[in-house]
Amino acid sequence: APVPPGEDSKDVAAPHRQPLTSSERIDKQIRYILDGISALRKETCNKSNMCESSKEALAENNLNLPKMAEKDGCFQSGFNEETCLVKIITGLLEFEVYLEYLQNRFESSEEQARAVQMSTKVLIQFLQKKAKNLDAITTPDPTTNASLLTKLQAQNQWLQDMTTHLILRSFKEFLQSSLRALRQM
């Protein structure tokens, strides 16, 4: 697994460097997670042809993965910093159950999957410090998450591979949108 942000040898070798600002730390954290997702997607796509044929192989996708919409205020048109930050944090909290599902779904990238999960927890903490309106953030219900996890794990192997692919793709898109939005804040 790659070294988490702030722990690479360059950082150790340059103690005179200015400490990262909160925004820089968040930016770096997201890019680190995106690198991890790329590695996981590589294993998933190499293992099956899910990455090319996912659209035509499905009639319905009821995964309900978090997605950015116009009303969330994260796009350039209608940008709203507070609304967007709430959406990013809420979305990441919703993704956590899916990241839990990804554990044990990888053979050669097991550590990488764990790193993505743990780094996302850290990212949520960074973002919560930045948010003024924490009351607007809804935390997913643990009971609902537990039954969702059971449902996902009860799927057959092919559906689980497809689920893994869709989670990684959606999480990547969500993080990329978040990164663009946070750079405007």
Partner: nanobody, 124 residues
Framework: QVQLVESGGGLVQAGDSLRVACAAS????????MAWFRQAPGKEREFVST????????YYADSVKGRFTSSRDNAKSTSYLQMNSLKPEDTAVYYC?????????????????WGQGTQVTVSS
């Protein structure tokens, strides 16, 4: 486990109608999707139709759209495929399949449980 048994196949003339049924038994409460596939001699198994078992939403292959209709009877845990305007190319063994999960597939690999199939022959 879920057991599936198809019935209602037979020999019909082109242009006729036929309704095949699929009765599910066992752990039917775990079913999220019920589908129909078919396999003609020497050909690969082909998707015909699938249904979200809880909402009743249906999806069809382009080749049967407008001619075939899928329906269900929840109380009897039975799925039906009404086939109208049948063509000789509809001749195949029709299989019923069921799956658990949040994704509803048009790919046979997305289904856990299968019936033994019922033969439908359409003569010209």
């Amino acid at each position: 486990q879920v057991q599936l048994v198809e019935s209602g196949g037979g020999l019909v003339q082109a242009g006729d109608s036929l309704r095949v049924a699929c009765a599910a038994s066992g752990r039917t409460f775990s079913i999220d999707a019920m589908a129909w596939f078919r396999q003609a001699p020497g050909k690969e198994r082909e998707f015909v139709s699938t249904m979200n078992w809880s909402t009743g939403a249906t999806y069809y292959a382009d080749s049967v759209k407008g001619r075939f209709t899928s329906s269900r009877d929840n109380a009897k845990s039975t799925s039906y495929l009404q086939m109208n305007s049948l063509k000789p190319e509809d001749t195949a063994v029709y299989y019923c399949a069921a799956a658990r999960g949040l994704l509803i597939a048009t790919d046979a690999r997305g289904y856990d449980y299968w019936g033994q199939g019922t033969q439908v022959t359409v003569s010209s």
